[in-house]
Interface confidence: medium
């Protein structure tokens, strides 16, 4: 279950620096498709975008507030921190963090939001916010089996690929013939690439995936690779060489 939770002081004094923490769970900030944004809403007013950060550490800031804002990710990959300097009473607002669904190249929309935290700026007493940190991550290993196999024309061939952690359906299969560029067969675990014969099919989700060739043809003798696209760095399986029997 995806959750985002904002924490920070409920009250800051004018000229002070505000530090807000967004603690996320149910997804990883190292996931290639994700980002986190901060948005605020003064009482009774519209939403205002402040800043965002993506898994590759790409950042962007509101033009009008750029000089006052800093956004960063905690190395634990579970927290995004926003600091805002030189606070003023007009900065009193509910501050939200939200997840950005980012499809690699084209940043898109906010699909999950935190509940928001109201920050008041006045010369009254101060408050404090907290936030912990979680564990780090590691590269996803893709284990293909078998590494080689002999088969005959007409055979049904099944190749498996196991991910070391859940990658949802972010898996593609490629065919590579000697001296040639890899050719994509399957994307999103089970979607057939346009122009690829229907004897190829893919299935699976989470950690277990299968490429099936229902009836092998002579041109199918090649090496097949799986590739995970869930988290940076993207990683390939070690390959399965399908050779002619005898």
């Amino acid at each position: 279950q995806v959750t985002l939770k904002e924490s920070g002081p409920v009250l800051v004094k004018p000229t002070e620096t505000l530090t807000l923490t967004c603690t996320v769970s149910g997804f990883s900030l190292s996931n290639a498709r994700m980002g986190v944004t901060w948005i605020r809403q003064p009482p009774g007013k519209a939403l205002e975008w402040l800043a965002h950060i993506f898994s590759n550490d790409e950042k962007s800031y509101s033009t009008s507030l750029k000089s006052r804002l800093t956004i960063s990710k905690d190395t634990s990959k579970t927290q995004v921190v926003l600091t805002m300097t030189n606070m003023d009473p007009v900065d009193t607002a509910t501050y939200y963090c939200a997840r950005i669904r980012d499809y690699y190249d084209i940043s898109s929309y906010y699909d999950y939001w935190g509940q928001g935290t109201l920050v008041s700026v006045s010369s009254g007493g101060g408050g404090s916010g907290g936030g912990g940190s979680g564990g780090g991550g590691s590269d996803i290993q893709m284990t293909q089996s078998p590494s080689a196999m002999s088969a005959s024309v007409g055979d049904r061939v099944t190749i498996t690929c196991r991910a070391s952690q859940d990658i949802s359906n972010y898996l593609a299969w490629f065919q590579q013939k000697p001296g040639k560029v890899p050719k994509r067969l399957i994307y999103a675990a089970s979607s057939l690439q346009s122009g690829v014969p229907s004897r190829f099919s893919g299935s699976g989700s989470g950690t277990e995936f299968t490429l099936t060739i229902s009836s092998l043809l002579p041109e199918d003798f090649a090496t097949y690779y799986c590739l995970q696209l869930n988290s940076f760095p993207f990683t390939f399986g070690g390959g399965t060489k399908v050779e002619i029997n005898g």
Epitope: W49, T63, A188, L227
Partner: antibody
Framework: EVQLQQSGPELVKTGTSVKISCKAS????????IHWVKQSHGRSLDWIGS????????TYNQKFKGKVTFTVDTSSSTAYMQFNSLTSEDSAVYYC????????????WGQGTLVTVSA | DIVLTQSPASLAVSLGQRATISCRAS??????????LHWYQQKPGQPPTLLIY???NLESGIPARFSGSGSRTDFTLTINSVEADDVATYYC?????????FGGGTKLEIK
Amino acid sequence: EVQLQQSGPELVKTGTSVKISCKASGYSITGYYIHWVKQSHGRSLDWIGSISFYNGATTYNQKFKGKVTFTVDTSSSTAYMQFNSLTSEDSAVYYCGRRGDDYDVFAYWGQGTLVTVSA
Amino acid sequence: DIVLTQSPASLAVSLGQRATISCRASESVDSYGYSFLHWYQQKPGQPPTLLIYRASNLESGIPARFSGSGSRTDFTLTINSVEADDVATYYCQQSNEDPWTFGGGTKLEIK
């Protein structure tokens, strides 16, 4: 038609650097990252990283960080990958790739650039 | 910055009637064949909820009475057959160009 045209083979000496290119054509480049992949002889593939034509934002596989540098020249629709301090381990075919419009990467590939590092 | 102008600022409709909210961008929010314009619903005291992404795609779990249309600079959110539960403020948002921006909001009330 989407095309990724890579520069020709390179024979370089150990300790030197090499810069290979990937020229994109047939589509509006700003919407897409270029991804780079390494394939050592007879081995599997390694994703090196990616760079955005839109704003030059890069993502590197930690394994290659400090070893490679990505750049883009939007005026010529060309992405570059520079390899520094080359060793025999860097001898490989390097591919550039681009996602398809289904939001998955590597629907399109360059033809590959063979880099041979010799003493 | 891209300015998003929503109209009307507030809207009162009868239950079962259709509500139409407009969002006009100061420049095109289309790129690569997509419109990077999204719609959110916000009820008092709650964070916004995504309704429609990329102009016309209904977010999972959102009732089919909500629909979005438009391209380039002119977009519309339509609620067919308004229900009492739809009383909220609706915002459009663009993510085509940094900095991302929101419209000023449209408050929907029941007549």
